[in-house]
């Protein structure tokens, strides 16, 4: 996981400035108010593999 | 590097009382919901109290099998988490861990502490 | 309560075999999006070591022999190669709800 300056976040993460490393997007649905959020509704989710 | 260090556990008496710490350190630890989980023979793993963060006020959780009996809290200046079990049964003997989640899995886990409740 | 049920209780493997783990919810745990259970390694005299996330997605430093599946109700765990190392027992975690609930464990040793 490295800062946005360097490479993006991996699919289905987005940068997090207050925790200063990428997060899930999918803890958005427990905690939608989290930083890193506004980056992961611009951004596809990880698809499933079933 | 992440560690999470627990304190408290020992022998106590059916309808006793216990307090354990758990001391965090390499994470930004006001950010991070604070459980408790333990673990039994007979139980399995199981999770039992929750705390979350100061900007909501610090909303707590519960399992059914401890509400009214455990209450956890935490300081966040000091990197802590406890949970104050009173009224204590024998089926609470078990191993207790404290464990990080940001919303969902458990990435980060304690070295657990025993609870032994008999007389 | 969200109940997990996995199959088998436990499970004896070849070296260089595969283990196959079940995890099944009482109800389903996914979104159009993500899927809330999550795999943990638990070894003797030792708290549970957290393996993978939504369902597929490994932590970092979890080799990629370890692997994840499934939406729904229905989860798998699939450890192949498996090692020696591997000999432990794994559990599945919902987060879908409060309260967040294990299953009761799968044993895996090895031949």
């Known amino acids: 996981e490295q800062a946005p300056g360097n490479a993006p976040c991996s699919r289905g993460s987005s940068w997090s400035a207050d925790l200063d490393k990428c997060m899930d997007c999918a803890s958005c649905r427990a905690r939608p108010h989290s930083d890193f959020c506004l980056g992961c509704a611009a951004a596809p989710p990880a698809p499933f593999r079933l | 590097e992440v560690k999470l260090q627990q304190s408290g556990g020992g022998l106590v008496q059916p309808g006793g009382s216990m307090k354990l710490s758990c001391v965090a350190s390499?994470?930004?630890?006001?950010?991070?919901?604070m459980n408790w989980v333990r673990q039994s023979p007979e139980q399995g793993l199981e999770w039992i109290a929750e705390?979350?963060?100061?900007?909501?006020?610090?909303?707590?959780h519960y399992a059914e099998s401890v509400k009214g009996r455990f209450t956890i809290s935490r300081d966040d200046s000091k990197n802590s988490v406890y949970l104050q079990m009173n009224n204590l049964r024998p089926e609470d003997t078990g191993i207790y861990y404290c464990?990080?989640?940001?919303?969902?899995?458990?990435?980060?886990w304690g070295q657990g502490t025993t609870l032994t409740v008999s007389s | 309560d969200t109940v997990l049920t996995q199959s088998p209780a436990s499970l004896v493997v070849s070296l260089g075999q595969r283990a196959t783990i079940s995890c099944r919810a009482s109800?389903?745990?996914?979104?159009?999006?993500?899927?809330?259970i999550h795999w943990y390694q638990q070894k003797p005299g030792q708290p549970p070591k957290f393996l993978i996330k939504?369902?597929?997605n490994r932590d970092s430093g979890v080799p990629a022999r370890f692997s994840g599946s499934g939406s729904g109700t229905d989860f798998t765990l699939n450890i192949h190669p498996v090692e020696e190392d591997d000999t432990a027992i794994y559990y599945c975690?919902?987060?879908?709800?409060?309260?967040?609930?294990f299953g009761a464990g799968t044993k895996l040793e090895l031949q």
């Open positions: 464990a990080c989640r940001y919303a969902d899995y458990f990435d980060h």
């Open positions: 390499g994470f930004t630890f006001s950010y991070y919901w």
């Open positions: 705390i979350r963060l100061q900007s909501n006020d610090y909303p707590t």
């Open positions: 109800q389903s745990v996914s979104t159009s999006d993500y899927s809330y």
């Open positions: 939504y369902a597929s």
């Open positions: 975690q919902h987060s879908w709800e409060i309260p967040p609930t």
